[in-house]
Interface confidence: low
């Protein structure tokens, strides 16, 4: 198996998408583990419901959610706000027994948040001049400051 | 495998406009500041165009240099991002590279190559 | 606008021998965090430019050891610890810390 590298945002909720044939792992619930060293054991994280037919269900274990598309054959996996001791190799599997199939090898990477909320100086890059406008060009999007929100930082 | 591929480069004469796009796949489009960076032949870098990211409300920034005459956006149901360029002069001619900002330009197009002139 | 200055602009190199770059910002990139906003970039040969530094002296994703970054809040210097034919091309260095960003002017290096 390839890995398969997810990149997502410290902070933000990355969607891991686990394709399989949906013929071949019929009837089979599926899980996601993480994998403890190189060729350690893959410690099970979240698995998909109890019965099979109830699989789209959304289960959650702490902030990691599991819902199987079952006709689709698609697995996916939610890891919500994630962190930088998220990062790792992951595994989804297909379960038959006591045994489990590797569906796909996944790396998880997790880059910094655009804005550290804690210290507004660290920033990617703090410095916003007057030739950064505040024009929302996206009209689909319009959002209003919350009180005291500063739409950007001071260069100092 | 983050992936960005620009398009819509071509000759355009001076006063002419032009819309260049760039297909972002292989991270989620709508997290990252996305930005513009240019290269007249046989010189050195410039910073164009920065538009931010979904939690920063999308707004938008130039380079005095082209600010009034190019205008970023994007299309995050397709990941795709844009410069609309108008009032094009021949110092615009250059490779213009799309990439996307987060310590600093981490992943580039390949470029697509704007000529102007008459 | 805050200028780039590098030097040299030309560098021929020898194979296993180090090379040193060296760029210089009118403005202090060293903001109150502790922070320094200074980024250095390659550009191949018939390539696109690819983030090597950020932050003045942090390697970016998959970038050799060999590649380290230095300096102060105005004075900065990327060096190769041992230069390989790969690492042939345009060195830029560029500051985050205000817009507009800029660039140096590309430091040209070529194996001897």
């Known amino acids: 198996h390839n890995t398969t590298v997810f990149q997502g945002v410290a902070g933000q909720s990355l969607q891991v998408s686990c394709p399989y044939d949906s013929m071949k792992h019929w009837g089979r619930r599926k899980a996601w583990c993480r994998q403890l060293g190189e060729k350690g054991p893959c410690q099970r994280v979240v698995s998909t419901h109890n019965l099979w037919l109830l699989s789209f269900l959304r289960r959650w274990n702490g902030s990691t959610a599991i819902t199987d598309d079952t006709l689709g054959g698609t697995l996916t996996i939610t890891l919500r706000n994630l962190q930088p001791h998220d990062a790792g190799l992951y595994q989804c599997q297909s379960l038959h027994g006591s045994e489990a199939d590797t569906l796909r090898k996944v790396l998880v990477e997790v880059l910094a948040d655009p804005l550290d909320h804690r210290d507004a100086g660290d920033l990617w890059f703090p410095g916003e001049s007057e030739s950064f406008e505040d024009a929302h060009v996206e009209h689909s999007i319009s959002r209003s400051l919350l009180e005291g929100e500063i739409p950007f930082p001071p260069t100092s | 495998e983050v992936q960005l591929v620009e398009s819509g480069g071509g000759l355009v004469q001076p006063g002419g406009s032009l819309r260049l796009s760039c297909a972002g796949s292989g991270f989620t489009f709508t997290d990252f500041y996305m930005s513009w960076v240019r290269q007249a032949p046989g010189k050195g870098l410039e910073w164009v165009s920065v538009i931010r990211n979904k939690a920063n409300g999308y707004t938008a920034g130039y380079n005095p240099s082209v600010k009034g005459r190019f205008t970023i956006s994007r299309d995050n149901s397709k990941n795709t991002l844009y410069l609309q360029m108008n009032s094009l002069r021949a110092e615009d001619t250059a490779v213009y590279y799309c990439?996307?900002?987060?310590?600093?330009?981490?992943?580039w197009g390949q470029g697509t190559l704007v000529t102007v002139s008459s | 606008d805050i200028v780039m200055t590098q030097t040299p602009l030309s560098l021929p190199v020898t194979p296993g021998e180090p090379a040193s770059i060296s760029c210089q910002s009118s403005?202090?990139?060293?903001?109150?965090?502790?922070?320094?906003?200074l980024n250095w970039y390659l550009q191949k040969p018939g390539q696109s430019p690819q983030l090597l530094i950020y932050?003045?002296?942090t390697r970016a994703s998959g970038v050799p050891d060999r590649f380290s970054g230095s300096g102060s809040g105005t004075d900065f210097t990327l060096k190769i610890s041992r230069v390989e034919a790969e690492d042939v091309g345009v060195y830029y260095c560029?500051?985050?810390?205000?817009?507009?960003?800029?660039f140096g002017q590309g430091t040209k290096v070529e194996i001897k």
């Open positions: 932050w003045m002296s």
């Open positions: 560029q500051q985050f810390l205000e817009y507009p960003f800029t």
């Open positions: 990439a996307r900002l987060t310590y600093g330009f981490d992943y």
């Open positions: 403005k202090s990139l060293l903001h109150s965090n502790g922070k320094t906003y």
